[in-house]
Interface confidence: medium
């Protein structure tokens, strides 16, 4: 049977950074996928590119190079995106969602021309297309709306860290989280910890197995879940202890709620 | 170890269409992280890549802009191989035709025999 | 698309000297995703450099890669016979893949 496949640095202000976690060096972590990251190497007082390992590893890690800049570099304002001219959208606008070959995992958004918004996607890192912006307000100055900018976003929602059905994910199903709500466990909204603490447990790509522990927003403890070595995503701890360390403190006590702490 | 296998006409006539398949073992065309891809190397142009195909959780393709709008490279499961089409060929596209898997993070690391196509009539 | 441009376009050097071969990309490619080939008349390519300096399985540690951002460099550290071919680069970063025009390192 033949199947058919879809078509588918800037100028510094002070040295000191904005932020203690700037300072610290590039962890890549215990764990063993393979994700483009970013960090602010405070020697040449630069953000660089380095590889992550997808759990653990410290605050002076950013999914772009633009996260990294404003986050770490004094006096850095994001240059405008500049739209495109007239009322046109580019070609790429309409490309179809393509993760790309490699099996990082990159928060990205594209525009879906069907749905006529700017959505999001994981990227793998490496190929795909360029229907893929590295925020949500990149991809509506250029696709949605490419005359009039639309007043920025603020991207760090907690429901862009919640696998949704747009989603491309590594298997077959999408995984979306479903959170119970009886008075007992936090609604994700109760949660103001690291939002990646709010992802499924994610086994990987590879054929290890190795043990691991994940953080459960729905009951607020941290299980064993089994990793293969690679991929998945930053839910992912060597320990019970360090998981819990990372993610319970994001919780809050809401006595009308019954939160448990 | 992974090994290709490539088949298919050294001639084919301007206008007609160029089919090439390679067979695939130690490895699954469906396999996550991993792209099976066609590049042709002729006197005048070096190595070019043409496109390839990969699975995540649907099948995925890309193509060189060159060729884009003669080329298709389609998956076959069930005799885990892949095939190139090329229509409407020229002379130009006279060239040794190499299959190859593309590791996501590391390279192509296997490659078929390669196979001339002559375009004459 | 990105452009590789491969120096120089032949290098005659002898056995047991060192070789030393550029490649310039006409923008940024990550270093993750930059490869070399070597390719001997009327073989098909062999990936021996993959992400610009992790050797493939099987390759002699006299061969390295290095380089950042534009600039990447294949290094042979001392030629032996076989070593006599001819060197691609290939960057896997964006989609079209793109490979340099090749540098042929021929016996002195």
């Known amino acids: 049977l033949s199947e058919e496949a879809d078509d588918t640095d800037s100028e510094l202000g002070s040295m000191k950074p904005l932020h203690t976690f700037c300072a610290m060096k590039a962890d890549d972590g215990p764990c063993k996928a393979m994700i483009r990251s970013y960090f602010f190497n405070m020697y040449t007082h630069q953000c660089e590119e380095f590889i992550y390992g997808g759990c653990e590893g410290n605050e002076n890690r950013f999914d772009t190079l633009e996260e990294c800049k404003k986050t770490c570099i004094p006096g850095y304002e994001k240059t405008a995106v500049k739209a495109a001219s007239g009322a046109e959208r580019p070609d790429f606008c309409f490309l179809e969602e393509d993760p790309g070959l490699c099996r990082g995992y990159m928060k990205r958004y594209l525009y879906n021309n069907q749905t006529k918004q700017c959505e999001r996607f994981v990227y793998g890192g490496c190929l795909g297309n360029r229907n893929n912006f590295e925020t949500l307000d990149e991809c509506k100055k250029i696709c949605e709306n490419p005359v009039h900018s639309p007043s920025p976003v603020n991207e760090v929602q907690m429901s862009d860290y919640v696998t949704d059905g747009n989603t491309v994910t590594d298997r077959s199903t999408v995984n979306n989280i479903v959170v119970p709500q009886s008075p007992k466990v936090p609604r994700r909204r109760d949660y103001r910890g690291r939002p990646w603490c709010l992802q499924p447990a994610d086994s990987g790509l590879c054929k290890a197995s190795e043990r691991r522990f994940y953080y459960n927003s729905a009951t607020g403890k941290c299980h064993r879940f089994n990793y293969t070595g690679c991929g998945g995503n930053n839910n992912n701890f060597t320990t019970r202890r360090r998981c819990l360390r990372s993610c319970k403190t994001g919780l809050i006590k809401n006595k009308s709620k019954g939160v448990v702490k | 170890q992974v090994q290709l296998q490539q088949s298919g006409p050294g001639l084919v006539k301007p206008s007609q269409t160029l089919s090439l398949t390679c067979a695939i073992s130690?490895?699954?065309?469906?396999?996550?992280?991993?792209?099976w891809g066609w590049i042709r190397q002729s006197p005048g142009r070096g190595l070019e890549w043409l496109g390839f195909?990969?699975?995540?959780?649907?099948?995925?393709?890309s193509y060189a802009v060159s060729v884009k709008s003669r080329i298709t490279i389609n998956p076959d499961t069930s005799k885990n191989q892949f095939s190139l089409q090329l229509n409407s060929v020229t002379p130009e596209d006279t060239a040794v035709y190499y299959c190859?898997?593309?590791?996501?993070?590391?390279?192509?690391?296997?490659w078929g025999q390669g196979t001339l196509v002559t375009v004459s009539s | 698309d990105i452009v590789l441009t491969q120096s120089p376009a032949t290098l005659s050097l002898s056995p047991g000297e060192r070789a030393t071969l550029s490649c310039r990309a006409s923008?940024?490619?990550?270093?993750?995703?930059l490869a070399w080939y070597q390719q001997k008349p009327g073989q098909a390519p062999r990936l021996l450099i993959y992400?610009?300096?992790s050797r493939a399985t099987g390759v002699p540690a006299r061969f390295s890669g290095s380089g950042s951002g534009t600039d990447f460099t294949l290094t042979i550290s001392s030629l032996e016979p076989e070593d006599f071919a001819t060197y691609y680069c290939?960057?896997?970063?964006?989609?079209?893949?793109?490979f340099g025009q090749g540098t042929k390192v021929e016996i002195k």
């Open positions: 190859a898997r593309q590791d996501g993070m590391g390279g192509m690391d296997s």
């Open positions: 130690g490895d699954s065309v469906s396999s996550n992280g991993a792209a």
């Open positions: 195909i990969y699975r995540r959780s649907k099948w995925y393709n």
């Open positions: 923008q940024s490619v990550s270093s993750f995703y």
């Open positions: 992400g610009s300096s």
């Open positions: 290939q960057q896997y970063d964006s989609t079209p893949s793109t």
